[in-house]
């Protein structure tokens, strides 16, 4: 299956077309209260959460969420089958992986069942809203006396779809050194000082081949290499070159 399956419409901005509909003109004396914005994220292409701020409603209201894809076998809206709740009020919907189509426009409609004319529709490109799991199994190995290689694993999403951000620092550094690694879950540091203790961590995002997600995963668990002296407070070295 092609690595170029990517960017169907990944280069478009996420479109949030809020379409507020109302009843016939003679009933327009009371303005329609806007509905909260729906935010969707696809977690590791395993499930998707679409949430909204239920506390923005003036009265506790169980809003309903319906969704469909712009081009699909079944073009009718289907209602959420697994609502998320905040203080017993609907505040989101969890959608299982079988219902996730990354490369079709996702159309989501939030509605007030008490006032059916009060509804908002948004269109989202899900391939830009993927958040991977944090990388796992970070391992360090010596390529030579002074060269280190860091490797890691990502679960479920193919490596070529991911971009990684590697951060490392020694106990003598005030800040992290960071760099982007594309698709290959490995990074080598050409020169390390064996008298220093180094810390490494990695996070990933679904970008740029298969989507254009700007959201990074959580950081991996850190791994350490080098001198096992007590880690010193970097601020002590703030004046060093």
């Amino acid at each position: 299956w092609s690595s170029k399956v990517l960017m169907s419409s990944a280069n478009e901005d996420i479109k949030a077309d809020l379409i507020l509909t109302s009843t016939a003109p003679e009933h327009l004396s009371a303005p329609t209260l806007p509905l909260p914005e729906v935010q969707c994220f696809v977690f590791n292409i395993e499930y998707m959460n679409c949430t909204w701020n239920s506390s923005s409603e003036p009265q506790a209201t169980n809003l309903t969420l319906h969704y469909r894809y712009k081009v699909s076998d079944n073009n009718t809206f289907q209602e959420c089958s697994h609502y998320l709740f905040s203080k017993e009020i609907t505040s989101g919907c969890q959608i299982q992986k079988e219902d996730i189509q990354l490369y079709q426009t996702f159309v989501v409609q939030l509605q007030d069942p008490q006032k059916p004319q009060r509804r908002a529709v948004q269109k989202l490109n899900l391939q830009n809203l993927v958040i991977p799991r944090a990388p796992e199994n970070l391992t360090l190995s010596n390529l030579s006396e002074s060269q280190l290689e860091l490797r890691w694993k990502s679960r479920h999403i193919k490596e070529r779809c991911l971009q990684y951000l590697v951060q490392y620092r020694s106990n003598r550094d005030r800040s992290w050194t960071e760099l982007i690694v594309n698709h290959e879950p490995r990074f080598s540091l050409p020169s390390v000082d064996e008298l220093k203790r180094y810390t490494f961590r990695v996070r990933s995002r679904y970008n740029p081949i298969c989507g254009s997600s700007q959201q990074w995963s959580k950081w991996s668990q850190p791994v350490h290499w080098g001198s096992h002296t007590v880690e010193e407070n970097p601020s002590l070295f703030a004046l060093e070159a």
């Epitope: 690595s3 399956v5 479920h156 298969c210």
Partner: nanobody
Framework: QVQLQESGGGSVQAGGSLRLSCVAS????????MAWFRQAPGKEREGVAV????????YYADSVKGRFTISEDNDKNTVYLEMNSLKPEDTAMYYC?????????????????WGQGTQVTVSS
């Protein structure tokens, strides 16, 4: 549109191996699920294995689990079906299929695009 072309079929003794290839061309968005199916004479077409464009998940029919492996080579736009420990009951015409939706399963009705097929014959 997606075009699919299978190759690699042939005749083999029971216990032998074959590797089928499916070269895909055309619309890349039409290939988010890619599967292998087979059809023996007088029988319905059945799903064998399916893989997906962006995730590592694969699914296999119970009858081939542990013997068949679906894999990909993105640079060549090719999907493979590695078939080991072949049995006479694996004799069939093997088809490659593709669909634009992620998470298609092993039902023929879920797939939009089909190849012409390649014949596999396993003799005892």
């Amino acid at each position: 549109q997606v075009q699919l072309q299978e190759s690699g079929g042939g005749s083999v003794q029971a216990g032998g191996s074959l590797r089928l290839s499916c070269v895909a061309s055309g619309d890349v968005y039409g290939r988010n699920s890619m599967a292998w199916f087979r059809q023996a004479p007088g029988k319905e077409r059945e799903g064998v294995a399916v893989g997906y464009s962006v995730v590592t998940t694969t699914y296999y029919a119970d009858s081939v689990k542990g013997r068949f492996t679906i894999s990909e080579d993105n640079d060549k736009n090719t999907v493979y079906l590695e078939m080991n420990s072949l049995k006479p009951e694996d004799t069939a015409m093997y088809y490659c299929a593709a669909d634009g939706n992620l998470w298609r399963g092993l039902r023929p009705s879920e797939y939009t695009y089909w190849g012409q097929g390649t014949q596999v014959t396993v003799s005892s």
